[in-house]
């Protein structure tokens, strides 16, 4: 796999161990936690990144109203099971044999069950809504400039094909970025919208996954854009299956967290 030959590092994933033991002495990088060889010319899958993160030492509106089936990742971090291609396995279980089904971005889409729980297929997240609030700025952002800059960012930094950035909405101070990618649209070699969204999420939290780069500096006509809060909604090709108890506000006692629907407060 391609990597920086001179010092043998992975430009797109700092959570790797690299050595010149590939074919012909080429640099090869493996993800921490899983040991899976990664392609350093593109983004690493979210599943492998989460696994690596868990293995690391612990130290009148133009805005979109999220669909009623939108999921928000409130469960936080877990150590996922990934398939040989680095995708999330449809069923995830923890050490106490509690299991649940996830979508292609690894977000829980069913109630938790036991080892008898069946997850027949990995359901694809085909629509991601990234909802940001930016910090007050000295100069206002022009919508079309902001749109162009965010599209450039996803194209250049995250290598996401422009056709998958469906829309950029702006109603100061809220910015919404809509990513859409159906199974049929995603060709071999295309970056997955879930992976691009995860890299972006880590960037705006000041936790860049890229090797050796400083934090993300995002400017619109020279004016820096600083993000105060981020909320990401995930929409699956097949709606999630949660019990009615959960949908009516139950099931979140005892300190457990759920992927609440959009009308819950976060």
């Amino acid at each position: 796999h391609t990597a920086a030959q001179d010092n043998c590092t992975c430009p797109t994933n700092k959570m790797t161990v690299c050595s010149p033991d590939g074919p012909g002495g080429r640099c090869q990088c493996r993800a921490l936690g899983s040991g899976v060889a990664v392609d350093c010319s593109t983004l690493t899958s979210k599943c492998l990144l989460l696994k690596a993160r868990m293995s690391a030492p612990k130290n009148a509106r133009t805005l979109v109203r999220p669909n009623e089936h939108a999921l928000v990742d409130n469960d936080g971090l877990y150590d996922p099971d990934c398939d040989p291609e680095g995708r999330f396995k449809a069923r995830q279980c923890n050490q106490t044999s509690v299991c649940w089904c996830v979508n292609s971005v690894g977000v829980r889409r069913t109630d938790k069950g036991d080892l008898s729980l069946r997850c027949d297929e990995l359901v694809r997240t085909h629509h991601i809504l990234i909802d940001l609030r930016h910090r007050p700025t000295a100069g206002a952002f022009n919508h079309s400039d902001l749109d162009a800059e965010l599209r450039r960012l996803f194209r250049e930094r995250y290598r996401l094909h422009p056709k998958f950035v469906a829309a950029v909405h702006y109603e100061q101070p809220t910015i919404q970025i809509e990513l859409r990618q159906n199974t049929s649209q995603k060709a071999a070699g295309d970056v997955d919208i879930g992976d691009a969204a995860y890299y972006f999420e880590r960037d705006v939290k000041g936790e860049s996954l890229f090797q050796g780069r400083g934090g993300l500096d995002l400017r619109v006509r020279g004016e820096p854009l600083q993000v105060e809060r981020t909320l990401i909604y995930y929409l699956d090709e097949i709606p999630p299956k949660f019990s009615m108890k959960r949908l009516t506000g139950g099931g979140s006692g005892g300190g457990s967290h759920h992927h609440h629907h959009h009308h819950h407060h976060h």
């Epitope: 000295a138 934090g215 500096d217 006509r221 020279g222």
Partner: antibody
């Protein structure tokens, strides 16, 4: 390390123009804006404007609009500040300073050039 | 424009003493930046985003505040801390600085 080096002192007559340069090194020149701030004798600091080398975007203090022009030469990593129609009250030390920022923080003006004294006298 | 008023204009203290410098904004700002200037030198950034210490700045410097009232504190003055201190806002254009507080040796 990041460094800004300014051109030398200038003496100008009222009505003339002055062009001060600021050469940057030690970082990716196009990645942050360069601001100009002046300090008149016995006075405080006064912001004049900034220029963003990546796309040439500029923001000027209205007080200096029409008199100040900021330009950039990316081939030499140099920014220029030209002030025209000089008057005696423009006598000041002129500083350039870079501002780094990320989506998380605005890191303020750091570092600053050593300053250029511009004296306007007939 | 946002006017920043610093107080006191002059602070006379001895080495080892605690210095508290105030910066009051004419309208609410989100963040304040603090700079130190010594005679014949360029200003130096001390604090960014109200409370974050700039690179290489000793931990005796700290910043706090919100809205219209901000503070720079030097917990124990060292001889090299005697200088003029300026606050600055980045909330609206034009960017403005306070008139400065001079910290002098008593």
């Amino acid at each position: 390390q990041v460094q800004l080096v300014q051109s030398g002192a200038e003496v100008k007559k009222p009505g003339a123009s002055v062009k001060v340069s600021c050469k940057a090194s030690g970082y990716t020149f196009t990645s942050s804006d360069i601001n100009w701030v002046r300090q008149r004798p016995g006075q405080g600091l006064e912001w004049m404007g900034w220029i963003y080398p990546r796309d040439g975007s500029k923001k000027y203090n209205e007080k200096f609009k029409g008199r100040v022009t900021m330009t950039v030469d990316t081939s030499t990593s140099t920014v220029y500040m030209e002030l025209s129609s000089l008057r005696s009250e423009d006598t000041a030390v002129y500083y350039c300073a870079t501002r780094f920022a990320t989506v998380v923080s605005n890191y303020g003006l750091d570092p600053w050039g050593q300053g250029t004294l511009v004296t306007v006298s007939s | 424009e946002i006017v920043l008023t610093q107080s006191p204009a002059t602070l006379s203290l001895s080495p080892g003493e605690r210095a508290t410098l105030s910066c009051s904004a004419s309208s609410s700002v989100n963040y304040i930046y603090w700079y130190q200037r010594k005679p014949g030198q360029a200003p130096r950034l001390l604090i960014y985003d109200t409370s974050n210490l700039a690179s290489g700045i000793p931990a005796r410097f700290s910043g706090s505040g919100s809205g219209t009232d901000y503070t720079l504190t030097i917990s124990s003055l060292e001889p090299e801390d005697f200088a003029v201190y300026y606050c600055q806002q980045w909330n609206s254009y034009p960017l403005t600085f306070g008139q400065g507080t001079k910290v002098e040796i008593k």
